[in-house]
Amino acid sequence: KSPIFGPEEVNSVEGNSVSITCYYPPTSVNRHTRKYWCRQGARGGCITLISSEGYVSSKYAGRANLTNFPENGTFVVNIAQLSQDDSGRYKCGLGINSRGLSFDVSLEVSQGPGLLNDTKVYTVDLGRTVTINCPFKTENAQKRKSLYKQIGLYPVLVIDSSGYVNPNYTGRIRLDIQGTGQLLFSVVINQLRLSDAGQYLCQAGDDSNSNKKNADLQVLKPEPELVYEDLRGSVTFHCALGPEVANVAKFLCRQSSGENCDVVVNTLGKRAPAFEGRILLNPQDKDGSFSVVITGLRKEDAGRYLCGAHSDGQLQEGSPIQAWQLFVNEESTIPRSPTVVKGVAGGSVAVLCPYNRKESKSIKYWCLWEGAQNGRCPLLVDSEGWVKAQYEGRLSLLEEPGNGTFTVILNQLTSRDAGFYWCLTNGDTLWRTTVEIKIIEGEPNLKVPGNVTAVLGETLKVPCHFPCKFSSYEKYWCKWNNTGCQALPSQDEGPSKAFVNCDENSRLVSLTLNLVTRADEGWYWCGVKQGHFYGETAAVYVAVEERKAAGSRDVSLAKADAAPDEKVLDSGFREIENKAIQDPRLFAEEKAVADTRDQADGSRASVDSGSSEEQGGSSR
């Protein structure tokens, strides 16, 4: 018995499309072997029409495709523009056509429903609007106009010109009689339901001289578009429902059990907790279209999504909708990266951001996810030297370690820095990752003075105390600027006395500025790193003033009196316009998993996709 399974019978009508899903055991061999769709001949052979290796028969050219979903153990054959010639017996299978790893499918394409003569066919999508036009003659101009629906053998009145409306159509139907010049009346039905489909009869007059017109209304349920994205990647649903619903609340929902479609996000401000920090609803265009970006795709995100428009901001019968079936590929090309990074007030975090290594020249960005309204992600820093004004001196985006990863360092942390941040580039939109920064109890590991004032022309020495846990790390001082932090020479002055219970492995490393000039004013960081992987940092602002008394300045920790929350940038710092991400290509991604490299106290944070084991920074 073959392990392949699928629909034994598929019945459709001419002009339609079919999507035939074939299921196979998702073993490693099966996932990667050839998939095919072939037509069985009278003599028992099976002629390939389409295969996963790119072959498409001339009979299927331009109207069929075969998509393999290895993670789910399925492949889907889509065939469009069906004709009766497509009726027959087929096989969907794996490997070689004659091998027997296949399933028999009978496809029957019929002519479609027989229609009465002079029947006008209206084909309209679910939730949309149809206008049924009904011509009449002059003698019936003043007579009653009506529309009936054929239910079984009997016509049932739907609406008439005397004001009757069938309860099934209340609030969504109207009868318009055109001006005297036009011998035509129209019935407009909004928010079409599947149950509205069927044969209609419009009539002017009630006697033997009445004018009648037959109409066949076909209400189409949207075929779900198949979307296949990588675990930890991102997906964008583009929803274009038409200008007629431009001012109606929009939503994206995910179908769960039965009839339920749980709102993921809507324009009324609702957002499902599972998507907190990793979803954005793009502002809609004038035509009512909008898009929703979900990052950090998880296995459980797979499923059927609907976008629609309804005043309630959720799915209701008659909502115009679009549908997607999202598959999440667990064999992801996107590496695991931390999803939660912990830091302490006054301390720092170093976040590793993955990007597509083929796009090393792309611009890198980091933005702060804001949940207000539909969500937005204003940029904080980019790799081209732009840093948001409020973050000057405490935020840096480094191209290191490179080869598919960049680093973002944020120091002088306060409770206000807690939240979700997105790593993204102007390249591959699938490589967008989300990291949550949590501020936890604890003291910063690196100790530096709070306020430092240097005197023009003199020498300044600024200490940085490193606890013994960093004994194996490279220690450095650098001067911060918009494009990074330029390394400066520093001196190891031996063990530090700033730590209780810390042995000879603690270190005091000083930055010395000789013959201070105005150009020396600014932010200085001391930090630790291992190769190209950065750990904790501490920041000091050095102000430069005129000489008052001779000599050099040696700053001690006693002067570190400013609390981290009190650090305020000089008002003279230039203000750069707040950049917010509008382009959906610049939206971000993801919740990821443990980084195996245990760095220092973990200011890089090793984390899991559900954030159940979070590793913190600056606190151990």
Partner: nanobody, 127 residues
Framework: EVQVVESGGGLVQAGGSLKLACAAP????????MGWFRQAPGQEREFVAA???????????YYADSVKGRSTISRDNAKNTVYLQMNSLKPEDTAVYYC?????????????????WGQGTQVTVSS
């Protein structure tokens, strides 16, 4: 709460026929798939047949090997009803037959993908 209600079960002789019906008045456009499952005494519930309708005049019918060629699943969308016509019945077809509905278009044989279930109708085939 959306409900489905089965009917048409009963006692039939081997070789006979039976037509089961499942009414799902509460299900609207999102009920893409309706399925039949059965459970014999002391056995696990197993897939029998399923039918999808894509809203555009296309039907997909799935059958278990055990009933292939002897059963036909169909649905009347106007009545929100699905039917299972069973012919050439065998004693081993004796079971409680359940109707189920799902919006999840994964493998139709997987029980836990069906969110809505009926109470079942007993089919007994005597030899």
């Amino acid at each position: 709460e959306v409900q489905v209600v089965e009917s048409g079960g009963g006692l039939v002789q081997a070789g006979g026929s039976l037509k089961l019906a499942c009414a799902a008045p509460g299900l609207t456009f999102s009920s893409y798939r309706m399925g039949w499952f059965r459970q014999a005494p002391g056995q696990e519930r197993e897939f029998v047949a399923a039918i999808d309708w894509n809203g555009r005049g296309t039907y997909y019918r799935y059958y278990a090997d055990s009933v292939k060629g002897r059963s036909t699943i169909s649905r009347d969308n106007a009545k929100n009803t699905v039917y299972l016509q069973m012919n050439s019945l065998k004693p081993e077809d004796t079971a409680v037959y359940y109707c189920a509905a799902t919006t999840v278009l994964t493998d139709p044989r997987v029980l836990n993908e069906y969110a809505t279930w009926g109470q079942g109708t007993q089919v007994t085939v005597s030899s």
